[in-house]
């Protein structure tokens, strides 16, 4: 129950915290579970206990095993188990799954990758960062404190990121590396009551008899992928397909993503060879989603030829 997996590479420093944490200053005793042998507290030992921490400076493959920590109190001893595995260094670049820390996700707005377990170590900036074993270079990458910031994250930024730092113990330096996967996700979306950008409510659209006319219904529904969103035209409250006038057709426009990141849709109503009777119809631009429906009405009026010539 109070057990935690820890892993590291041979010849690197590994520091493990007792999974059964007490508060600072409580006495913590460490044992090697297989032999029940006490772990020494003297820092001259390669493996030694320091309060809640068990330090391997550096680690060896033979150190692998289960370690018991007991947080001592006269009325409430608490026992934890650290399952430690030390692996041989890989000769190739590939980092095996068993050496990977938890995957983190980032987006355009939040692209921090924290260096796993670094808070256990006595390290000084800067951290070195690698992606798929290549040192990260360029102004997009900024090593800041214990994390990496990537500017303008793109899907290509997904991959395995390794942080490398130096742990200092009494003047001696030990290397530590830790790797985790980074995935890029779309910014969290949201949905709003539809907002119709065009046409304006009760707009009068001037058309010329005998010519073609286009009406565009444009609405925005929120940010990111929308579960249900639609724009459409109605004629006198009837769907275009049911109205039965082949000269009047709607044609889906392109999905739009404006500079402010909103998810918007267009629907174009095409009227061929505008006739007098078309001026008597009520044209409704409808935008609907899970929040509800919004309607803007347009009427057609004949364009005055005099205005046209002027």
């Amino acid at each position: 129950k109070f057990s935690k997996q820890s892993w590291g590479l041979e010849n690197e420093a590994l520091i493990v915290r007792c999974p059964r944490q007490g508060k600072p200053s409580y006495t913590v005793d460490w044992y090697y579970s297989q032999t029940n042998k006490s772990i020494p507290t003297q820092e001259r030992n390669r493996v030694f206990a320091s309060g809640q921490l068990l330090k391997f400076l550096p680690a060896a493959v033979a150190d692998s095993g289960i370690y018991t920590c007991i947080v001592r109190s006269p009325t409430f001893n608490r026992t934890g188990y650290a399952n430690v595995t030390i692996y041989k260094k890989q000769s190739d670049c590939n980092v095996p799954d068993y050496l990977m820390y938890s995957t983190v996700s980032g987006s355009e707005k939040n692209s921090k990758i924290y260096c796993p377990t670094i808070d256990l170590y006595n390290w000084t900036a800067p951290l070195e960062w690698f992606k798929n074993c290549q040192a990260l270079q360029g102004s997009r990458y900024r090593a800041h404190k214990s994390f990496l910031v990537i500017d303008n994250v793109m899907t290509e930024d997904a991959g395995d990121y390794t942080c490398k730092f130096i742990h200092n113990e009494n003047g001696a330096n030990y290397s530590v590396t830790a790797t985790r996967s980074f995935t890029v996700k779309d910014e969290q979306g949201f949905s709003l009551f539809p907002v119709i950008g065009a046409p304006a409510q009760n707009e009068i659209k001037e058309v010329e008899i005998g010519k073609n006319a286009n009406l565009t219904c444009s609405a925005c529904f929120g940010k990111g992928t929308q579960f249900l969103a639609a724009v459409l035209w109605q004629l006198n409250g009837t769907k275009i397909t049911d109205f039965g006038e082949p000269r009047i057709q709607q044609e889906e426009g392109q999905n739009q993503s404006f500079s402010n990141g909103l998810a918007c849709l267009d629907m174009v109503l095409r009227i061929a060879d505008v006739k007098e009777e078309d001026l008597l119809l009520q044209y409704d631009c409808l935008a609907l989603n899970l929040h509800g429906l919004r309607r803007h009405t347009v009427r057609l009026s004949r364009k005055n030829p005099i205005d046209h010539h002027s």
Epitope: R20, G22, K23, S25, T27, R72, S73, P74, F76
Partner: antibody
Framework: DVQLQQSGPGLVKPSQSLSLTCTVT?????????WDWIRQFPGNKLEWMGY???????YYNPSLKSRISITRDTSKNQFFLQLNSVTTEDTATYYC??????????WGQGTSVTVSS | DIVLTQSPASLTVSLGQRATISCRAS??????????MHWYQQKPGQPPKLLIY???NLESGVPARFSGSGSGTDFTLNIHPVEEEDAATYYC?????????FGAGTKLELK
């Protein structure tokens, strides 16, 4: 954050049993820690009554051992105090709390209990 | 049972001055390098709040003007400089053995 919410009657008749409930949110009572009952008498004296650990083990103040029972309902994340054969001397404000190591780190709001006929 | 005796029972201190509260145990509460004495603050209508654990360790979020010291049977809580919000009753508590017991409390008032 661990939060403890107390409930139970404010008035108990002498010789009857006092029963209080502490509902814990933000942490499972079977995960770790000890879950205490403490009372504060009208003169402000504090008395630790006992606790039930995450494992189900109970520890009671010997002064109350014959009358006290601390139990729990893990499905509701609640623990309970039952104090039998109460007298007017048991009039106090009763607190539930959690002991992480040796100290009571989180407390309930307190329930004032009067023993009177 | 270990009996904890607090003194004084009440204390009046001017703003900005030092308040010193003592707690004496009927037997040693120290063992294996730790002293199992803790301090709480209680304001009217509220439950006690942990200030200091293991005699001298400041609980997370508690202002640094609170400090604790002592070992064996004699322990002290110091508040310096005393602020208005420190008006409260202070209790010591041990955890050396069962049953856990509390001191009778020291009421701190401000001049």
């Amino acid at each position: 954050d661990v939060q403890l919410q107390q409930s139970g009657p404010g008035l108990v008749k002498p010789s009857q049993s006092l029963s209080l409930t502490c509902t814990v949110t933000g942490y499972s009572i079977t995960s770790d820690y000890a879950w205490d009952w403490i009372r504060q008498f009208p003169g402000n004296k504090l008395e630790w009554m006992g606790y039930i650990r995450y494992s189900g083990d109970t520890y009671y103040n010997p002064s109350l051992k014959s009358r006290i029972s601390i139990t729990r309902d893990t499905s509701k994340n609640q623990f309970f105090l039952q104090l039998n054969s109460v007298t007017t001397e048991d009039t106090a404000t009763y607190y539930c709390a959690t002991t992480m190591m040796d100290t009571m780190d989180y407390w309930g709001q307190g329930t004032s209990v009067t023993v009177s006929s | 049972d270990i009996v904890l005796t607090q003194s004084p029972a009440s204390l009046t201190v001017s703003l900005g001055q030092r308040a010193t509260i003592s707690c004496r145990a009927s037997k040693s509460v120290s063992t294996s390098g730790n002293s199992y004495m803790h301090w709480y603050q209680q304001k009217p209508g509220q439950p006690p709040k942990l200030l200091i654990y293991l005699a001298s360790n400041l609980e997370s979020g508690v202002p640094a003007r609170f400090s604790g010291s002592g070992s064996g049977t004699d322990f002290t809580l110091n508040i310096h400089p005393v602020e208005e919000e420190d008006a409260a009753t202070y209790y010591c508590q041990h955890s050396r053995e069962f049953p856990l017991t509390f001191g009778a409390g020291t009421k701190l008032e401000l001049k």
